[in-house]
């Protein structure tokens, strides 16, 4: 039995005390204006469509429509009792975008189109978004409009972030297959792109894909393997969007940063965080270029955005996303280093500069502070009981450090009789000494290790 809860009050004249569905007249299969309840709220009837007359004689308006008298007053039971006719008007007045990619003046028109579609045994039209198709619902006063500064940065820089893919040849068939991919960013309108050296190598064909899907063969112009920076070039007609390099030396701990990359065609991956340490005594990471500083951030850097830019909120590049060390700690090559590389690369290509040798042992390390030691101790139960020294994050294969027996998670506490408080101490000794007699804390043992640095090109 139908309830009368849906009826207008006071009750329309002539309504039964109790609704009896059996007394409801049969209804056509399709109603142009959609279904509605009769004046008594008992029977489902065909509602009048938008723009049709409504009121006591004409019957109710269809779903989502309301009966409005010429003065714009919704037709109540009182109006109907005066037998004053109104017009069916859509309760919603804003445009909507339908799943058929058409923009409808209001929700009611979309519903009418959906009913017509179903009558023709086609899929119903559903609402995809408020507002016209292809147009965002931008309310300049909305919170998301005001406060999505990260999205604003991404929108600004994304066109200059590229997807890089490397191809190799199969040995006999010589067919090319993809072997690796990474990201990069455009630094000159004529097609110079900066990426990580580990993303590209001379043995491979390098393909670059722009945000718009255009693909180009790239030539490797210059590589600094130790700093892990590479410069590649595409030939493009017209001007390309570029990213400007900011001053990494002016970065402050706590600044918002955005790491962006293009791990797949036509898609960007975005992570965000803050600067944890501005110029992490880069020597500390023990990367081959011992006099280089790194930016430490908690923005996640992974294979997807490796080689892509780390930017500040002005959209300036303040680093190249380069490596993830452990959960929550990632590093980027500072933009000041990129500037230096680009300047030197320009000089090298102009006059072929001589390069001085550097000493290298092959570890990535960081200074151990009491807070860092506590954090590591919480993470690894067998972490040594030390609060200072140089903590080894990684031992690079086929290096003097590996040959000497250094291992990941070791803490260097002294070299050649001098105590080691920070990773800088290790870097300084490497520069000066040809043999390093180290005391290393491993678990809760002290181990003697000898490492002989090798000379390499910077």
């Amino acid at each position: 039995q139908l309830s009368r809860a849906g009826r207008s009050a006071p009750l329309a004249a002539g309504c039964p005390d109790r609704c009896e569905p059996a007394r409801c007249p049969p209804q056509p299969e399709h109603c142009e204006g959609g279904r509605a309840r009769d004046a008594c709220g008992c029977c489902e009837v065909c509602g009048a469509p938008e723009g049709a007359a409504c009121g006591l004689q004409e019957g109710p308006c269809g779903e989502g429509l309301q009966c409005v008298v010429p003065f714009g007053v919704p037709a109540s039971a009182t109006v109907r009792r005066r037998a004053q006719a109104g017009l069916c008007v859509c309760a919603s007045s804003e445009p909507v975008c339908g799943s058929d990619a058409n923009t409808y003046a209001n929700l009611c028109q979309l519903r009418a189109a959906s009913r017509r579609s179903e009558r023709l045994h086609r899929p119903p039209v559903i609402v995809l978004q408020r507002g016209a198709c292809g147009q965002g619902q931008e309310d300049p006063n909305s919170l998301r409009h005001k406060y999505n500064f990260i999205a604003d940065v991404v929108e600004k820089i994304a066109p200059a972030v590229v997807h890089i893919e490397l191809f190799r040849k199969l040995p006999f068939s010589k067919r090319e297959v993809p072997v690796a991919s990474g990201s990069g960013f455009i630094v000159s309108e004529d097609g110079l792109i900066v990426t990580n050296a580990h993303v590209v190598t001379n043995k491979h064909r390098v393909k670059v894909e722009l945000k718009n899907g255009a693909t180009y063969e790239a030539k490797i112009k210059d590589v600094d393997e130790k700093a892990d920076i590479a410069l590649i070039k595409i030939d493009h007609q017209g001007k390309l969007p570029v990213l400007l390099l900011g001053r990494s030396s002016e970065l402050r701990p706590g600044e918002f940063v955005v790491a962006i990359g293009s791990p797949f065609s036509l898609q960007n991956t975005v992570t965000t965080g803050i600067v944890s340490t501005t110029q992490r005594g880069g020597k500390e990471l023990g990367l081959r270029n011992s006099d280089m500083d790194y930016i430490q951030t908690d923005a996640i850097i992974n294979y997807g955005n490796s080689g892509g830019p780390l930017v500040n909120l002005d959209g300036e590049v303040i680093g190249i996303n380069t490596l993830k060390v452990t959960a929550g700690i990632s590093f980027a090559i500072p933009s000041d280093k990129i500037k230096k590389f680009l300047t030197e690369s320009h000089d090298r290509q102009a006059k072929g500069k001589a390069i001085t040798k550097k000493k290298y042992i092959g570890i990535r390390m960081m200074s151990l502070t009491s807070s860092k030691a506590k954090e590591l101790k919480d993470r690894h139960r067998d972490f040594p009981d030390v609060i200072s020294g140089a903590y080894i994050i990684e031992v690079i294969p086929d290096t003097p450090a590996e040959a000497g027996g250094l291992k990941e998670n070791d803490v260097i506490i002294s070299i050649n009789g001098q105590s080691v408080v920070s990773a800088n101490d290790v870097s300084d000794v490497i520069k000066r000494e040809s043999t390093l007699n180290m005391v290393v804390r491993r678990g809760n043992e002290d181990i003697m290790i000898t490492v002989i640095p090798e000379e390499i090109d910077p």
Partner: antibody
Framework: QVQLVQSGAEVKKPGASVKVSCKAS????????MHWVRQAPGQRLEWMGA????????AYNQKFKGRVTITADKSASTAYMELSSLRSEDTAVYYC????????????????WGQGTLVTVSS | DIQMTQSPSSLSASVGDRVTITCSVS?????MYWYQQKPGKAPKLLIY???NLASGVPSRFSGSGSGTDFTFTISSLQPEDIATYYC????????FGQGTKLEIK
């Protein structure tokens, strides 16, 4: 993980043919060439030939040219090696092995191997 | 065709010994590869691109050399290292050395 699973041991008469299969899993079958290497008792490993599963292109060791046919079925991720006109000196363990590739140096080697199929040729 | 000469063809050593195997080729090659094969098993890659350790291989194994002369070394022999070792080059097509059978004294 990458796995290459070969068909079982075979005993053949001289003059006959043998067809050994190798089912690959754990990687994109068409991104690597599949090679066949054999090892006669007490002998060194001997490369027989290879196939690019995507195109069906093959390369053979001249020593076996005309007697060996390598094929691949992309849809089944399976490679086959057929050796005809068998003689007693073809008694060996036959291995399928995937061509590996060094990203750093650009060199080629064999990184994954099947368990081997013993083919005995005896009258 | 490139000729490969691996030596010695067999050797006996004690646990903890340093073991060296050499491989010479008739023409200069870019890289050498080294495999270990245990009885009844398929070969297993140990060293690629002359000196790089394959994934999961203990650091006591190493490789060196260039051009026509290459060396494979086990710094401290372990009982589980008993096997036959093969060098392999890939010039116009892959060829293997005749193998070195390693036994424990």
């Amino acid at each position: 993980q990458v796995q290459l699973v070969q068909s079982g041991a075979e005993v053949k008469k001289p003059g006959a043919s043998v067809k050994v299969s190798c089912k690959a899993s754990g990687y994109t079958f068409t991104d690597y060439e599949m090679h066949w290497v054999r090892q006669a008792p007490g002998q060194r490993l001997e490369w027989m030939g290879a196939i690019d599963p995507e195109t069906g292109g093959t390369a053979y060791n001249q020593k076996f040219k005309g007697r060996v046919t390598i094929t691949a079925d992309k849809s089944a991720s399976t490679a086959y090696m057929e050796l005809s006109s068998l003689r007693s000196e073809d008694t060996a363990v036959y291995y399928c092995t995937r061509e590996g590739y060094s990203y750093e140096g650009g060199g080629y080697y064999f990184d994954y191997w099947g368990q081997g199929t013993l083919v005995t040729v005896s009258s | 065709d490139i000729q490969m000469t691996q030596s010695p063809s067999s050797l006996s050593a004690s646990v903890g010994d340093r073991v060296t195997i050499t491989c010479s080729v008739s023409s200069s090659v870019s890289y050498m590869y080294w495999y270990q094969q245990k009885p009844g098993k398929a070969p297993k890659l140990l060293i690629y691109d002359t000196s790089n350790l394959a994934s999961g291989v203990p650091s006591r194994f190493s490789g060196s050399g260039s051009g026509t002369d290459f060396t494979f070394t086990i710094s401290s022999l372990q009982p589980e290292d008993i096997a036959t070792y093969y060098c392999q080059q890939w010039y116009s097509y892959p060829t293997f050395g005749q193998g070195t059978k390693l036994e424990i004294k």
